[in-house]
Structures are given as C-alpha cells and as structure tokens.
Interface confidence: low
Amino acid sequence: SAPGEDEECGRVRDFVAKLANNTHQHVFDDLRGSVSLSWVGDSTGVILVLTTFHVPLVIMTFGQSKLYRSEDYGKNFKDITDLINNTFIRTEFGMAIGPENSGKVVLTAEVSGGSRGGRIFRSSDFAKNFVQTDLPFHPLTQMMYSPQNSDYLLALSTENGLWVSKNFGGKWEEIHKAVCLAKWGSDNTIFFTTYANGSCKADLGALELWRTSDLGKSFKTIGVKIYSFGLGGRFLFASVMADKDTTRRIHVSTDQGDTWSMAQLPSVGQEQFYSILAANDDMVFMHVDEPGDTGFGTIFTSDDRGIVYSKSLDRHLYTTTGGETDFTNVTSLRGVYITSVLSEDNSIQTMITFDQGGRWTHLRKPENSECDATAKNKNECSLHIHASYSISQKLNVPMAPLSEPNAVGIVIAHGSVGDAISVMVPDVYISDDGGYSWTKMLEGPHYYTILDSGGIIVAIEHSSRPINVIKFSTDEGQCWQTYTFTRDPIYFTGLASEPGARSMNISIWGFTESFLTSQWVSYTIDFKDILERNCEEKDYTIWLAHSTDPEDYEDGCILGYKEQFLRLRKSSVCQNGRDYVVTKQPSICLCSLEDFLCDFGYYRPENDSKCVEQPELKGHDLEFCLYGREEHLTTNGYRKIPGDKCQGGVNPVREVKDLKKKCTSNFLSPEKQNSKSN
C-alpha cells in the first residue's frame, strides 16, 4: 500500500469538520493573467497580491493590474487598487518588500513612452497607504534596500546611472554614471563596477570596482581589470583579467576591498565561469567551471580567509553561466548540502555532504523502495534527488527540495531510486534526520510545504486535471489524511504559506474556468483546530544530530561539536506555535584529523583521513601571494575547517611566514588605489 495508508496510521479526529470551519475562499474579480504574491513583514499576516492582465490590441498591448491586501494570512482580501490610483504595475520589478519588519513596500509603475522618468508607489505602513513618487530616471532594476537601513534605497537607471535615496524613495540623487552592477555591502556600503569606453559588455574584463561608504559623498577605486564581482558572507570576490591573456582569476578581500589576495583557485578562460554556491562568515563554496562545454566543474571549499581552497567535489553539474545547478543548502541541519554530479557516462547522480563539503557520499537507499531500471544491481542503489536541473529539463518535478531551519532534520524532495536520476515520474521522499536516511513519503509528484515548524506537512498532487483535495500529515509524513477543500475543482497554480514555516495557514491558489471566463481563486486553510493544544515538555524528545554510531564516543561530532535537539515526537499532535524556538544543546568535541582540511599543496587520498603532499609540489617551498606580499607556508598538511569548534586532541602545526617580498597579482595594490570625493 502507499505510504500512510496502512492500518497502523492513527487518524486525526473529526478533522473534516474542523478544517471545513477554517477554510476561506476568495474569488478575485479578475480575468486570469498573472498573479504574484508577497508577504509583508514577519508574523503580521499581511499579504499583497498583484494580478496583471495584458489585452493585446492591434497596435499596442493594453495592461491592467489590480492590487489586493490581506491582513489575516489570506483568509480575506480587500481590493486596494485605488490606493495606487489604478496604475498598471510592472510585474518584472515585482513588489520590493523592505527588510525585517520595516513594513516598507515599493511598487514600480508602467509609464507612457515620453515621460521624463519612472513612477513608484511607496508604503511604510505594511501597505495600508501608498505615496506616489515620480522618479528623475527610468529604473532598470528593482529598488534595492540597504540591509542595515530600510530608508536607504539604490537603483540602476536605463542610462546606467547609479541612483540613491536616503529617505525611502522620496528624493533621489545620481551618485555615479556608467555603472554596470551595484550591490549593498555591510554598514550601508555600496560596491559597483563602472565602464570607461562605451558599455558594460564592451568593457567586460576592463571594468573598475568602486566603493562608497557614505552614500556617494566620496568614492574609492578598489579594483581594476574587473570582469565581475560578488559578495558572500564577509567575503568580497572579484574576478580579474590576467595581464597576458584572456584568462581571469578570483581575488578575495575580507576588509571591504582595502586589501586583496589572489585565491588559490584555477584560472578560467573566456567561456568558463566562477560561481559562489554558498557563503557564510566562516567559508565559501566556490564552483569553478571546466574548460569546454562540459556542463560540469569542480567545487572548492575555502579556508577562513577565502584564500586557500580544498577540492571538495569533482564533476559538479552546473550547465552554463547563470545556468542550472542542483546545489542545495539543507537548512534543517548544520553542515548538510546536496548537489548533483555528472558521471562519466553522462548520467546524473546526487551527492550529499554532512560536514560542509569535507566528504561527499551517495544518498542511502530508502528502506521502503526498490531500485529502478537505472540500477545495475537491484540490491544496491541510491536515492537521487530532483532539483533545479530536473525542473529546467521539464521533467515532472513541480518543486525543488524543501527544508526549514526550525523544522529540524526534515528534508522533503522528489527523487528516484537507482544508479542515477531517472526521467520516469518521480515520487516524494522525506528524511527526518537531515539526509542520512530517507523514506518514500508520497507516490508521484506533489507540491509540498511545512507548517508549524514541522508539526504539519501539507501536500497537493501535481496534476494537469483540476483538483479539490489536499493531503496533510501530523507525523512528519508517515501517515496522511485527505481533505476535500472545495466541491468544484480548480486548476491549481501554487501553494503559499508564510516564509519561515511557523504559520498554520496554507493558501491554495488556482483558477476556475467556465465557458466565458476564468478567474483567480484562493482557498486558505487554517490548521489550528487540528493541532488542538499547545505542545508541552512531554511532547518533545531528545535527538542527537548527525548520530550515525551511538556506540562511538565521537558520535554526532560535526565541525568540532555535537548538538542535541528537543524534537516533537511524531505521535504528538499539538501546536509548536508561532513563538517556537529550536532548543539545542551543543557540546564541544575533541579534535581529530576529520576536523582539518588539507592545506595548500596537500590533498586527501580517497577513503583516507590523512593529508599527503601533492606530488608536483614535493620538496618545493610552499609560497603564495597574500595582501601583495610573498608568504612562506610551514605546514604538516592540515588546516582547521572554518567554523570548526573542536578543542584539544589532534593538533597539527601550521605557520605562515611573511617573506618580506613584494608580489603582484594583476591587481591594484592598496597603495596605488585612488580615492575621490564628490
């Protein structure tokens, strides 16, 4: 029988009546076009819905949009289009929602061809009121909020000007011309690239990287010969053209661009690319594309300075620049990432790491699944996860893998069980331990979401036919109940729940189609009465994360410490609640070789924890360029993994000596960098 449909599943009592009383329908007075939905603030219940409809006329396209607002998590909506003077809103800019709980919203309007500038509508009270503001420029990009101060906005114009507002879009000032890309850094700093000779495209590889720390009063050139730049964690990266040829190298700064070091990564040619897959304040995952149109590259993990890199994973699937990669941070368990590799026979396989890229392994075969036709050995195979690449290939995969930081250990994903990803219709699998073990959760493709910090999982079957049934589970996907939320089926377009998985409300979006017209409709279901009581201490159990061998003294140690969590028992049907905080108790582990990466010039042979010298560097002095000085590295081959908190135990020696020699890295050295003021 399908998972959750056997006799041992305890049923939730009287759930049909409870859900029926908490199901709210809203039919939108709209012709079907496109719909976009944004949550405004955290735990406010405020949702903005923008519907747009294009009527193609003979000479031009006439557009119409409507704006709706809910303040009860989508149970009721009010048409507030009049607050924006019935103006047509440009959907490509989306709704720019302010950071944290600022309550700020910016909508960018469509304006007629001859106008001097664009127009925005601004709200700072969670979309209760809007102020119309005419801009002195035509925006090219969505308004970007400073993460530190939501009154500070930046935008690029269609003329490549960099515009800044210090009063939430009321007044704008052009602080620089000829700008290609601009990003907020920390402390209200803006980084941007500029061109000198004509255009961003023409000057690619000859751009300058600039910084302003005072919103455009003064500037500092912090890099030349720039191809592109990126920010990740506390690292600033720039890819820089080499002097002699068309290759480029990554340079990294941890002081906002004042000083730079060349990253110990391979250089790339014109057709290749670098990509920051993930970054935090400790380290970076960097993808380096292989030469040629291979569709794969290598993942490297950095040290705590972002300079020395260790090879983490070969043949990492990443199709083209800005293309598809399956790299996924499993946010429900520290240190876990999932991605895909392209094997020699061009099949795609899923790999998982539990220690932040130190080791990668195949996903364990689910207990309740058989190996499919891709498996050579029917008794030995792995689970392979469908993610962005499968979605881009139009496989029958409606959703990418899902995990939430406050639903500890839970990962939900579409997958197939065999030697590689299959093009057959996938099933849905769940892990409750952060990816170590998996179970088939639902037959066939589904949309899914997590509510109440994992207390409820909701799913809807992916079907081309209209639907009227939703499935839900209160025991982490073991058992499922079905609820018919409407008598008249709808063409389903999406599930929406408040980001953060704390809510107990789910909105089902779709449209109804009749002979004459089609209309948007939403059904919002509140599960609060299913989880009747608040969870108590007895509802939680202690769980040791990353536990693979309870008999081992070091069991659960990942990155130098282990964590015990209080987790909801699967049998408990109760509310974690909106204020639920993950309870965890860390304890430090003693250092072993597993807590160290191989240093510059060393590598780890397969299935060995010891680092050995790279043959080509044997007997050579290890010297590299750091902050424009030649450095000599004395090492026995190990360096602590960034973020690793182990203490005691194994303690390999590592020392970096300044050789007092200058070295250049095709980059502007700090003393040559110029500053200027406006």
């Epitope: 008999e551 081992d552 003294y553 304890s587 430090i588 072993s592 203490q647 005691g648 135990g649």
Partner: antibody, heavy 117, light 108 residues
C-alpha cells in the same frame, strides 16, 4: 552491576615508570569512552587522560602530554595507563572512570602511586 | 583553558539545612557541567550531569541548576550522609576537562 577495578599502583623512584590497569565488568566496555583521573593526597581531582570507545582518539592535558599514555584492549575489557619519567608531584590516587560524554558516571576504587626516593 | 571557581571552599551546616554550592566558569559552557560527591577514602560519585539532570539513584533532595557561566548544586534538606566534598567539572572544550577545587561540607 558496573565495576571498575584499578591495579598496578605502588612505590616508584623519580624518573621511573609504572603501568596502571583497570578491569571493567558489568557493562558493554567497547561503547564507552574511558578516563583516568588522579587525586594528590589532601588535594582535589585532576583529569589525566581520556580514550575514545574504539581507542582511536586519546586526549591529555598539556602538562602530562608525552609522559602519560592511555590505551585500551576492548577484547579484554581493560583500560591501561602507562606513566613514564615520574616525579614526586605525580604521587596520587589514580582512578579509572567510565566516560560516556558529559560526565564520568562510574569510578573505580583507585590505586595509589607513590613517587619517592 | 576554561577556569572553574567553586565556592565556598568549605562550609559548615546542620542536618535539615538547605545548602547551596556554586561553580563559576570563565566562559559559557552551555550547561555541559557535572557535579560529584566524594567521601573520605572513597571514590567520587556522580550526582548531576548536564547541569540539571540527576544521575541514577541520587536522592531528589539534590538538584542542579544554572546556565551560561554560573551553576549551582543545591541540597534542599541536609542528611547526615551528605557530609562530604563536592566537585564540579565542565565538559565544554578540551584540554583540560577541569574540575573545580572542591567544597568541603562539614557538620556544624
């Protein structure tokens, strides 16, 4: 019933060596970390060494590194402590303790080591 | 190294008294702390682990509390067999897993 019985203590001259043993019974020895802790006459407790369940990892305070070696034989349910270059300040009762992680939950009765000329 | 400061170093009390012994740690140890009791000529006995959990067979008059850097062992009603020396020990980071210097509890 969990039992830990130390042996091997005695009188030894400064600079000499001694091997302590601890025989374990009443529990599955090979799934627990084990530790040595000592107590000088009239003084407090001092952690000396720890070994992981499989014997892969060993840990010592800096002051004892190089002079004390902890080892175990899981087949014999035994823990050992090899002490070299003994000094007068190593005089103490040496306890072996079961160490599952966040505490030392069972202790032996101790064996006295006296370093004196 | 993490420093442990146990106080008082000794104290006199009577049967039936409520007694509190504290252990202050030089940095946050996230409740990774144990308490032991040792009687003269005997080996130590575990009372409390993970700051608040009573070990098997320990009478309920003993309790542990605290978090961060400050931890307390409380005996709610002192019994004659409780007169002993008490030690705290942390398990957050190594080396060393330091013990407190001990608190000697004597009959008044």
């Amino acid at each position: 019933e969990v039992q830990l019985v130390e042996s091997g203590g005695g009188l030894v001259q400064p600079g000499g060596s001694l091997r302590l043993s601890c025989a374990a019974s009443g529990f599955t020895f090979n799934i627990y970390g084990m530790s040595w802790v000592r107590q000088a006459p009239g003084k407090g407790l001092e952690w000396v060494a720890t070994i992981s369940s499989g014997g892969i990892y060993t840990y010592y305070p800096d002051i004892l590194k190089g002079r004390f070696t902890i080892s175990r034989d899981n087949a014999k349910n035994s823990l050992y402590g090899q002490m070299n270059s003994l000094r007068a300040e190593d005089t103490a009762v040496y306890y072996c303790a079961r160490h599952p992680g966040g505490a030392m939950d069972y202790w032996g009765q101790g064996t006295l080591v006296t370093v004196s000329s | 190294d993490i420093q442990m400061t146990q106080s008082p170093s000794s104290l006199s009390a009577s049967v039936g008294d409520r007694v509190t012994i504290t252990c202050r740690v030089s940095e946050n140890i996230y409740s990774n702390l144990a308490w032991y009791q040792q009687k003269p000529g005997k080996s130590p006995k575990l009372l409390v682990y993970a700051a608040t959990n009573l070990a098997d067979g320990v009478p309920s008059r003993f309790s542990g509390s605290g978090s961060g850097t400050d931890y307390t062992l409380t005996i709610s009603s002192l019994q004659p067999e409780d007169f002993a020396t008490y030690y705290c020990q942390h398990f957050w980071g190594t080396p060393p897993w330091t013990f407190g210097q001990g608190t000697k509890l004597e009959i008044k």
